[in-house]
Every structure is written in C-alpha cells, then in structure tokens.
C-alpha cells in the first residue's frame, strides 16, 4: 500500500518521443514496471521499461521513431498505462488519455554559439531541436546570463514572445566571464511547459581598451 | 472544479446486479478520469475501478475484474459502473472520485481531488 500520493506524468516532444515519470511517495518499487502507449489511430504500440532516477520516481522514454519524424498530431490521443509485474501477469497501477498536444515539452536548444562579442554587448544565437513544424513561430524563448559570484537561481529571466533564435546580451562588463543558457515553449498546450534549459554556453566579454571608453 | 453526485445504490440480493451513475458538473467532464472506491463498514475506502477521459481505458481491482464494467458518456457527463454476480463482500458505500484535470488515474485515494458524496450499496445472502 502507498501512504502518500503517487502520480504519473508524460511529456511529447512533439515529433517522436514521449516521456514518462512515475513517482510514488513512500513507496519502495522492487519490481518492474513499464508504461504502455495505445494510440487511437495508429497502427502501432509502444512500450518502455521504467528506470529509477530517485527513490521514489521512475522515467523512461517511449521511442515512437526517428528523432525528427512527425509521429502524432493534434487530433490524436494515446491511452497510457503505468504496468507493473505481479507474479507472472502484469497489474495496472495508472491510466490516462494523454493528448500530445496538450501535454508539450520540447527538447532544450541547441548549438549556443558566439556570434559576436564586444566589451559590453554579446550577441547570441541558438537551434531548436526536434520541434514539429506544426508551430511554425508559436514559440517562446527564456534565456538567462550568468554573472561572475551569482547562482543560475538569481540570474533574472529575459523574455523572447516570439520565435527569435538569438539575443543580444547588453551592459555587460568587460573581460568578464559568463554563461548563458535558454529554453523553449510552445503557446499550445493546456499542460505544457518549459523545455529544459540548454547546455550552458560559456563566453567572454573583449577587455577595455586603455584610455579609451568603449 | 468538478462536482460529482453518485445514484443508483440499494439493496439486492446476492447474485444479482446493479448500476450506478456519477454524475458531474463544472468543469469540462472529458478532462476527468473518474474512478469508484468503496467503503465497508468498519474497513479502510478502497479502489474499485477507474476509467479514462474518453472511455477508451479502464482498470480494476483483482476483487471485482469480469464481474464490474465502467463506462462513460461524456456528452451526458455521467460514468457508469455496472456491478454483476454481487455478493455479500460487495456491500459498503459507493464513491465516485476525480484527480485533477489532465491527471492519470490511480489506485490510490490520495490522488484524487474531488469526490461525491457515496451512494449505499448493500448485497444480502
């Protein structure tokens, strides 16, 4: 018996890949499990084997094919099941209706490059990853800089409304280091949400020239 | 929210066989798994069965698999949790229960956010 809650929640990527957390408060799972993915109008099934990330929760990817092949749309809607093995048959332990669209998370973005950097201004772009061409530019983009002594927590969040792969970074202070991470969103989606942050890119302010302000 | 209202509890003998309604109202109904629990006197509320937003998925208890059915009517917004072969063990009160919108169903209570009042189902020998 579980004492505390437990909750199963599953995130598209919006081309080919659905993943999957199963958590279970006060719960030690020493058996194996797997979620099971049943379309409603597709011709397949897809199965993946829960792998633990803590002490309480589970994840695994359901693989649906090749990382840029548009698997499901808007209308379609996947009936997921969390299984675990009791004896020698599989016993339900959760079930949902998942619609994909409505349950976005996108890959975090790609290929942070330096395009140009000065002493006080940088200049930024990134790719995003896997992202289905339904949204043509209903995107949104986060983007945070890391400052010298300063946490990613306390780094104030810039805001993209639109789909704009690139920032230009300003007042910065010269020959400093820095870092910089960005994250993608959808605008559709009832449960959507932020995509994990990029790989932070790190880069260096140009020194000030001496006696003269830049 | 979601308000839930169950109906069609009683007494029947041993046997025989029931149907019970959960009736919503509020929020958009296809959003909602709902799921039944059951409570004997004198005993802890426990999973009966659970249904997904649009029908296509149920699960039960190893108690009450092949003798109870659920299904729904979204446009009606009513679940149905048909009971068959029923039997003294089967007796308590019956609720019908809802996690939040979007969410998965569970076999367990403390998932589930809202909740009706219960209908009493009693199964005489």
């Known amino acids: 018996a579980v004492n505390g809650t437990s909750q199963f929640t599953c995130f598209y990527n919006s081309r080919a890949n659905i993943s999957c957390v199963w958590s279970q408060d006060g719960a030690l799972q020493d058996t194996s499990c797997q979620v099971h993915a049943w379309p409603d109008r597709r011709r397949w099934n897809q199965t993946c084997e829960l792998l633990p990330v803590s002490q309480a929760s589970w994840a695994c990817n359901l693989i649906l094919g090749a990382p840029d092949s548009q698997k499901l749309t808007t209308v379609d809607i996947v009936t997921l099941r969390v299984l675990c093995r009791e004896g020698v048959r599989w016993r339900v332990m959760a079930i949902q209706d998942f619609k994909p669209f409505e349950n976005l998370r996108l890959m975090a973005p790609i290929s942070l490059q330096v395009v140009h950097v000065e002493t006080h201004r940088c200049n930024i772009s990134w790719e995003i990853s896997q992202a289905s061409h339904y949204f043509e530019r209903h995107l949104e983009f986060e983007a945070r800089t890391l400052s010298p002594g300063h946490t990613w927590e306390e780094a104030p969040l810039l805001t993209l409304k639109q789909k704009q792969e690139w920032i230009c970074l300003e007042t910065l202070t010269p020959d400093t280091q820095y870092e910089f991470q960005v994250r993608v969103k959808p605008l559709q989606g009832e449960f959507t949400t932020w995509s994990p942050w990029s790989q932070p890119l790190a880069f260096r302010t140009k020194p000030a020239a001496l006696g003269k302000d830049t | 929210q979601v308000q839930l209202q169950e109906s069609g509890g009683g007494l029947v003998q041993a046997g025989g066989s029931m149907r019970l309604s959960c009736a919503a109202s509020g929020r958009t109904f296809s959003n909602y798994v709902i799921a039944w629990f059951r409570q004997a006197p004198g005993k802890e509320r426990e999973f009966v069965g659970a249904?997904?937003?649009?029908?296509?998925?149920?699960f039960y208890a190893s108690s009450v698999e092949g003798r109870f059915t659920l299904s729904r009517l979204n446009d009606q917004s009513t679940v149905y949790l048909q009971m068959n072969s029923l039997n003294p063990e089967d007796t308590g009160v019956y609720y019908c229960?809802?996690?939040?919108?979007?969410?998965?169903?569970?076999?367990?209570?403390?998932?589930?956010?809202?909740w009706g009042q219960g209908t009493q189902v009693t199964v005489s020998s």
């Open positions: 229960s809802a996690p939040r919108s979007g969410r998965a169903g569970t076999r367990n209570q403390m998932d589930y956010e809202y």
């Open positions: 249904i997904t937003q649009t029908g296509r998925g149920t």
